[in-house]
C-alpha cells in the first residue's frame, strides 16, 4: 500500500501591477498530477502582511487570488495543494508548502515620508487629502500622490495639488465615479536634490471618511404644553435620509444643556412653562447602516426661539 | 546564503584616499539596500551611509562631503570611496544589508588606519 | 540628530542572572525603528531584537525588548556564557541614523 503524495504548486509568486497595494497572487499546478486526472485540486492559500498576528486563508481551485496589501510593510504568503479524500480513498492528502515573499524596496530614511496624512470626503462627494512635509526635508522636496480604485484602468495621478511654500501638501480629487464601498489605494512618493524620499501608502473605503454638510432648516413646533418639538432638513447632497445619525445640543435659558444623539431629523423635548429661551444646534454623521465610520459635520446654524409664552413661537436666527 | 565581505582597508597617510569595496552574495543589490557603518578601535558604531536598492544614497551629513557610496549592480557590489582621510578616521568599517528598515546582515569588517 | 544614551556602560553579572540594559533617545523615536544588536570581541555586530520586541531569526527567547517613545530595555532573562558581549541599541527613524553607545556586559 504506497502512500499517496502530492508536490506543492510551481512558479509561485506575488506580482504587483502597479495598483499601489492591490496585489495577485498566482501559480501553477504542481508537477505529476497525471496520476489523479479524474481529480478537481484544490489549493490552501495562506497569505497577510509581514508583522500581522494572523494569516488569511482561502481555499481555492483557481491558479490565482486577488487582495490588497499595505505595501509600507512586506507580505509574505504560502500555498500547497490539496487532494479531496474522494481522491485518495481515504484522508485529504496535503502537500508541502511553497513560499514567497514581496516587499517594495524602499529608499530614502522613514522620518522623509509625509507626516499626519489625512483625506476627508466631503459630503460624499468631493475629497480632499492632506498632508505635512516628512521631518528635515528641504523645500526642494515635492511630493505627488497617486490614486488607484477597482474600476480604474491604472493609477492617477493628482492633477490638483494644494500648495504651500511651493510645496504640494494636499490634494484635491475629481469626480470619483463608482469609487466607494472598495478599497481606495494611494501612494505619496517624493522627489529632493537633497535625498531620497520615502513612499507611503494608505488604504481606505471613501465611505468612511465621508464628513457631511450640518443639517438646514431648524425649526420648533409646540406639541403640547410640556412639548416642543426640533426639526431640521437633511443637508443638499447624495447622501439619503436613512444615512443620517444626528447630534443636537439644546441650551435652556443659558444654563441647562440637553445632548442627545438621535436616528430622526426630530426630537420632543421636555420644558417647563418656566422655560424663557431655547437654543439648539445639530450636526450629522453617516450612520453604521452605510459605513463603518465617518467623521461629524460642523456644528448647524443656531436656531433659538424665546419670549415669555414660549406658545407665541417668537422664532429667532 | 547571505554574506557580505569588505576589503580594501589598510594604512593610508592624512589627506589621503582610501576605496573600500563590499562583495555581496545570497541577495541582489537591486533588491536591498546596504549601508556602511564604521567603528573606531574601542568605541561604538557610527552610521556612514547606504546606498538604496533604486540606487539613491542617504548620507550621514557630517561625512557627506568627504566619503562618496556607489555600486555596481552587475558585480552585486557596494563601494565605499573615502577622500581628504583624517585620524579619526580610523576605524573597522562594515557593510550591512537593509532589511526592513534594520541591518539584518554584517560583514566582517576592513580595517581602515590613517596616520603618518 | 537623535542621541542614544544606553546605561549602564557596563555591568557585571553571572550566569543565570538577569540583565536589564536601558536606551535614552533625545527626541520620540517609533518602536518600528528601534533595534538592538549584539556585539561580541573582535565579531561583526549581530541583530539580535527588530522594532523594539521582535527577536530576530535565530535568537533564544530569553531575550526580550520593549519600551516605547523615548524609552527603551533589552532585557536577558537568565544571563548565559554566550551572552558576554557589548549591546548596543540603534534609531532608524531620523537622518543620521544612531547607536548607543554600547553596554559591555562582563562576566562577574
Known amino acids: 500500500d504506497t502512500e499517496i503524495k502530492v508536490n506543492p504548486p510551481q512558479d509561485f509568486e506575488i506580482v504587483d501591477p502597479g495598483y499601489l497595494g492591490y496585489l495577485y497572487l498566482q501559480w501553477q499546478p504542481p508537477l505529476s498530477l497525471d496520476h489523479f486526472k479524474e481529480c478537481t485540486v484544490e489549493y490552501e492559500l495562506k497569505y497577510r502582511n509581514i508583522g500581522s498576528e494572523t494569516w488569511k486563508t482561502i481555499i481555492t481551485k483557481n491558479l490565482h487570488y486577488k487582495d490588497g496589501f499595505d505595501l509600507n510593510k512586506g507580505i509574505e504568503a504560502k500555498i500547497h495543494t490539496l487532494l479531496p479524500w474522494q481522491c485518495t480513498n481515504g484522508s485529504e492528502v496535503q502537500s508541502s508548502w511553497a513560499e514567497t515573499t514581496y516587499w517594495i524596496s524602499p529608499q530614502g530614511i522613514p522620518e522623509t515620508k509625509v507626516q499626519d496624512m489625512d483625506c476627508v470626503y466631503y459630503n460624499w462627494q468631493y475629497l480632499l487629502c492632506s498632508w505635512k512635509p516628512g521631518i528635515g526635508v528641504l523645500l526642494d522636496t515635492n511630493y505627488n500622490l497617486f490614486y488607484w480604485y477597482e474600476g480604474l484602468d491604472h493609477a492617477l495621478q493628482c492633477v490638483d495639488y494644494i500648495k504651500a511654500d511651493g510645496q504640494n501638501i494636499g490634494c484635491r480629487f475629481p469626480y470619483l465615479e463608482a469609487s466607494d464601498y472598495k478599497d481606495f489605494y494611494i501612494c505619496v512618493n517624493g522627489s529632493s536634490e537633497n535625498k531620497p524620499i520615502r513612499s507611503s501608502y494608505f488604504t481606505f473605503q471613501l465611505q468612511n471618511i465621508v464628513k457631511p454638510l450640518p443639517p438646514v432648516y431648524l425649526t420648533f413646533t409646540r406639541e403640547s404644553s410640556c412639548e416642543i418639538k426640533l426639526k431640521w432638513s437633511i443637508p443638499l447632497g447624495p447622501i439619503p435620509a436613512r444615512c443620517f445619525d444626528y447630534e443636537i445640543e439644546i441650551r435652556e435659558d443659558d444654563t441647562t444643556l440637553v445632548t442627545a444623539t438621535v436616528e430622526n431629523e426630530t426630537y420632543t423635548l421636555k420644558t417647563t412653562n418656566e422655560t424663557r429661551q431655547l437654543c439648539f444646534v445639530v450636526r450629522s454623521k453617516v450612520n453604521i447602516y452605510c459605513s463603518d465610520d465617518g467623521i461629524w459635520s460642523e456644528w448647524s446654524d443656531k436656531q433659538c426661539w424665546e419670549g415669555e409664552d414660549l406658545s407665541k413661537k417668537t422664532l429667532l436666527r | 546564503e547571505v554574506q557580505l565581505v569588505e576589503s580594501g582597508g589598510g594604512l593610508v597617510q592624512p589627506g589621503g584616499s582610501l576605496r573600500l569595496s563590499c562583495a555581496a552574495s545570497g541577495f541582489s543589490l537591486t533588491k536591498y539596500g546596504v549601508h556602511w557603518v564604521r567603528q573606531a578601535p574601542g568605541k561604538g558604531l557610527e552610521w556612514v551611509g547606504v546606498k538604496w536598492a533604486g540606487g539613491s544614497t542617504d548620507y550621514n551629513s557630517a561625512l557627506m562631503s568627504r566619503f562618496t557610496i556607489s555600486k555596481d549592480n552587475a558585480k552585486n557590489s557596494l563601494y565605499l570611496q573615502m577622500n581628504s582621510l583624517r585620524a579619526e578616521d580610523t576605524a573597522v568599517y562594515y557593510c550591512?544589508?537593509?532589511?526592513?528598515?534594520?541591518?539584518?546582515?554584517w560583514g566582517q569588517g576592513t580595517l581602515v588606519t590613517v596616520s603618518s | 540628530d537623535i542621541q542614544m544614551t544606553q546605561s549602564p556602560s557596563s555591568l557585571s553579572a553571572s550566569v543565570g542572572d538577569r540583565v536589564t540594559i536601558t536606551c535614552t533617545a533625545s527626541l520620540s523615536v517609533s518602536s518600528t525603528y528601534l533595534h538592538w544588536y549584539q556585539q561580541k570581541p573582535g565579531s561583526s555586530p549581530k541583530l539580535l531584537i527588530y522594532s523594539t520586541s521582535n527577536l530576530a531569526s535565530g535568537v533564544p527567547s530569553r531575550f526580550s525588548g520593549s519600551g516605547s517613545g523615548t524609552s527603551f530595555t533589552l532585557t536577558i532573562s537568565s544571563l548565559q556564557p554566550e551572552d558576554f558581549a557589548t549591546y548596543y541599541c540603534?534609531?532608524?527613524?531620523?537622518?543620521?541614523?544612531?547607536f548607543g553607545g554600547g553596554t559591555k556586559v562582563e562576566i562577574k
Open positions: 540603534h534609531q532608524y527613524h531620523r537622518s543620521p541614523l544612531t
Open positions: 550591512a544589508r537593509d532589511h526592513r528598515d534594520a541591518m539584518d546582515y
